[in-house]
C-alpha cells in the first residue's frame, strides 16, 4: 500500500539535491582557497539535519544553526551588495567587481541558490514531489526559513556604505514583502552602517525618468532614515553600459551618466 504523502502547492525538491549541494560546496572551496578548511560532508550533514524528518511547515532558524556555524565566513563588511528582484544583474556586477559580494557569493548563498528542498515529518525521505509554497501553504518552510536566516546574518554583518540593486521595471521598485524589504532592511545595524545607497536599474531603452522619486523609493528612504541610516539613490539608466564601465572604467564614454 503506497504511503500517503502530503501534497504541497509548490515544486518539489530539486532533483539531485544532495549531490548538487555537496558538489557546490567542493566547488566553492576550490575557487575560494580561504574556505578550504570547510568539511563539505559535514556541511551537507548539517544542511540535511535542518529539514529531514521535520514537518516542512515547522522549520525554525534554530534548525539551521549547525549549518550557519559551519558556513561562518568573513566578507569585507563595507563591500556588500544587496539586491531585490534583479539577481542576474547583481551577480554579473560582482563577477566583474570582484571585491564586492552578494549573498550568493558567500558559501551558504552559493550552496542554496535556485534550489528547492523539503522533507517529511518522521521519515528520512526528501520530498521530490512537492514542497510548501510560502503564500499558499506556510511561511516557515525549509527554503524560506533558510533565506530569512542567511539574509538576516548577511545584513547584520554589513557596515559603512551598503549598496542595494533594485529593479526599476517592477510596479513596486521597493517591495516591503521581499527578502530585502522584510528582512535585510530591518537588520542593517545603524551603529555600523552609515549609508544605504540604492541603485535603481532601468529596463526601458528610452526611460529617462528619475525613478529615485518613485513613491516606493521614498517609502524605503523613510524606513531607512527612521533607523538613523542615511539614504542615497542613483538611477542606472543603461545597465549594459554600467557593466561595461565597471569592466573598463577608463573608457571615454564612461564619464557621462549611465
Amino acid at each position: 500500500v503506497p504511503r500517503w504523502r502530503q501534497q504541497w502547492s509548490g515544486p518539489g525538491t530539486t532533483k539531485r539535491f544532495p549531490e548538487t549541494v555537496l558538489a557546490r560546496c567542493v566547488k566553492y572551496t576550490e575557487i575560494h582557497p580561504e574556505m578550504r578548511h570547510v568539511d563539505c560532508q559535514s556541511v551537507w550533514d548539517a544542511f540535511k539535519g535542518a529539514f529531514i524528518s521535520k514537518h516542512p511547515c515547522n522549520i525554525t532558524e534554530e534548525d539551521y544553526q549547525p549549518l550557519m556555524k559551519l558556513g561562518t565566513q568573513t566578507v569585507p563588511c563595507n563591500k556588500i551588495l544587496l539586491w531585490s528582484r534583479i539577481k542576474d544583474l547583481a551577480h554579473q556586477f560582482t563577477q566583474v567587481q570582484r571585491d564586492m559580494f552578494t549573498l550568493e557569493d558567500t558559501l551558504l548563498g552559493y550552496l542554496a541558490d535556485d534550489l528547492t528542498w523539503c522533507g517529511e515529518f518522521n521519515t528520512s525521505k526528501i520530498n521530490y514531489q512537492s514542497c510548501p509554497d510560502w503564500r499558499k501553504d506556510c511561511s516557515n518552510n525549509p527554503v524560506s526559513v533558510f533565506w530569512k536566516t542567511v539574509s538576516r546574518r548577511f545584513a547584520e554583518a554589513a557596515c559603512d556604505v551598503v549598496h542595494v540593486m533594485l529593479n526599476g521595471s517592477r510596479s513596486k521598485i521597493f517591495d516591503k514583502n521581499s527578502t530585502f524589504g522584510s528582512v535585510e532592511v530591518h537588520n542593517l545595524q545603524p551603529e555600523k552602517v552609515q549609508t544605504l545607497e540604492a541603485w535603481v536599474i532601468h529596463g526601458g531603452r528610452e526611460d529617462s525618468r528619475d525613478l529615485c522619486q518613485d513613491p516606493t523609493i521614498k517609502e524605503l528612504e523613510s524606513i531607512i532614515s527612521k533607523r538613523n541610516i542615511q539614504f542615497s539613490c542613483k538611477n542606472i539608466y543603461r545597465p549594459d553600459k554600467f557593466l561595461q564601465c565597471v569592466k573598463n572604467p577608463e573608457d571615454s564614454s564612461c564619464t557621462s551618466e549611465i
Epitope: K27, P33, R36
Partner: antibody
Framework: QMQLVQSGAEVKKTGSSVKVSCKAS????????MHWVRQAPGQALEWMGW????????DYAQKFQDRVTITRDRSMSTAYMELSSLRSEDTAMYYC?????????????WGQGTLVTVSS | DIQLTQSPSFLSASVGDRVTITCRAS??????LAWYQQKPGKAPKLLIY???SLADGVPSRFSGSGSGTEFTLTISSLQPEDFATYYC?????????FGQGTKLEIK
C-alpha cells in the same frame, strides 16, 4: 567513463583569435570547476584560468586577463577557451582539466590537448 | 604569485634506482601540492595530491612527502615506464603555479 575531448589542432595568424573547445562526458558537467592550462614547446605547464560551468563565473591568471575568455555551453557540456591578439609566444598545447573532488584540488582528469600554432 | 623551484632539472638514473625530486615553494603552501608525470605528446598524469596521497591507479613505488615549503617526490625502484618529465603544482592559492619540471632520463 569520464572523458574530456578537445577540438583539433589550429594554425592561426598573429593578431587573430583562437577558440578551443572541451567536451565533457561521463559526469555531471556543472558539478566540477573546469580549468585551462597551456604548455609551450619544451616549456613548463602554465595555468590560465577556470570556469564554474553552473553559473559561468570565471577567474583568469593576471598574465592572460586581457586576452582570454572562458565560456561554456551547459546544454552541450562543453567549455571553451578563447585567446585573442595571438602572438608567436602563444604557440602551445592547450589543455582543459578538472579535479576529482577526492584528490585535493590536483587535476585528476585532462583533455588530450589542442595544439595551437601561431605564425606570421 | 607563488614560485615553485624543482631540482634537479635533469636526472639520469637506471632501472631499479631510487630517485628523489625536490620542489621548493616561495611561501608556505601547507600540503596543497600535486605531482604529475608527463610523457612526450601526452597530457600530464596526476601521481600525488595533497603532498603525500597517492592518486588512483598509481603504483606504490611513487610517494610524496613534505609540507610548508619543501616537498619531495620519491620513486623507490625505477621502472622503464617511469622515464618522463615530472612537475609539481601548488593549489594553495590562485594563480595555480607549476614547477619548471624535472626530466628523468635513462643513464
Amino acid at each position: 567513463q569520464m572523458q574530456l575531448v578537445q577540438s583539433g589542432a589550429e594554425v592561426k595568424k598573429t593578431g587573430s583569435s583562437v577558440k578551443v573547445s572541451c567536451k565533457a562526458s561521463g559526469y555531471t558537467f556543472t558539478d566540477y570547476i573546469m580549468h585551462w592550462v597551456r604548455q609551450a614547446p619544451g616549456q613548463a605547464l602554465e595555468w590560465m584560468g577556470w570556469i564554474d560551468p553552473e553559473y559561468g563565473r570565471t577567474d583568469y591568471a593576471q598574465k592572460f586577463q586581457d586576452r582570454v575568455t572562458i565560456t561554456r555551453d551547459r546544454s552541450m557540456s562543453t567549455a571553451y577557451m578563447e585567446l585573442s591578439s595571438l602572438r608567436s609566444e602563444d604557440t602551445a598545447m592547450y589543455y582543459c582539466a578538472r579535479s576529482a573532488h577526492t584528490t585535493g584540488f590536483g587535476f585528476a582528469y585532462w583533455g588530450q590537448g589542442t595544439l595551437v600554432t601561431v605564425s606570421s | 604569485d607563488i614560485q615553485l623551484t624543482q631540482s634537479p632539472s635533469f636526472l639520469s638514473a637506471s632501472v631499479g634506482d631510487r630517485v628523489t625530486i625536490t620542489c621548493r615553494a616561495s611561501e608556505d603552501i601547507y600540503s596543497n601540492l600535486a605531482w604529475y608525470q608527463q610523457k612526450p605528446g601526452k597530457a600530464p598524469k596526476l601521481l600525488i595530491y595533497d603532498a603525500n596521497s597517492l592518486a588512483d591507479g598509481v603504483p606504490s613505488r611513487f610517494s610524496g612527502s613534505g609540507s610548508g615549503t619543501e616537498f619531495t617526490l620519491t620513486i623507490s625502484s625505477l621502472q622503464p615506464e617511469d622515464f618522463a618529465t615530472y612537475y609539481c603544482q601548488q593549489y594553495n592559492n590562485y594563480p595555480y603555479t607549476f614547477g619548471q619540471g624535472t626530466k628523468l632520463e635513462i643513464k
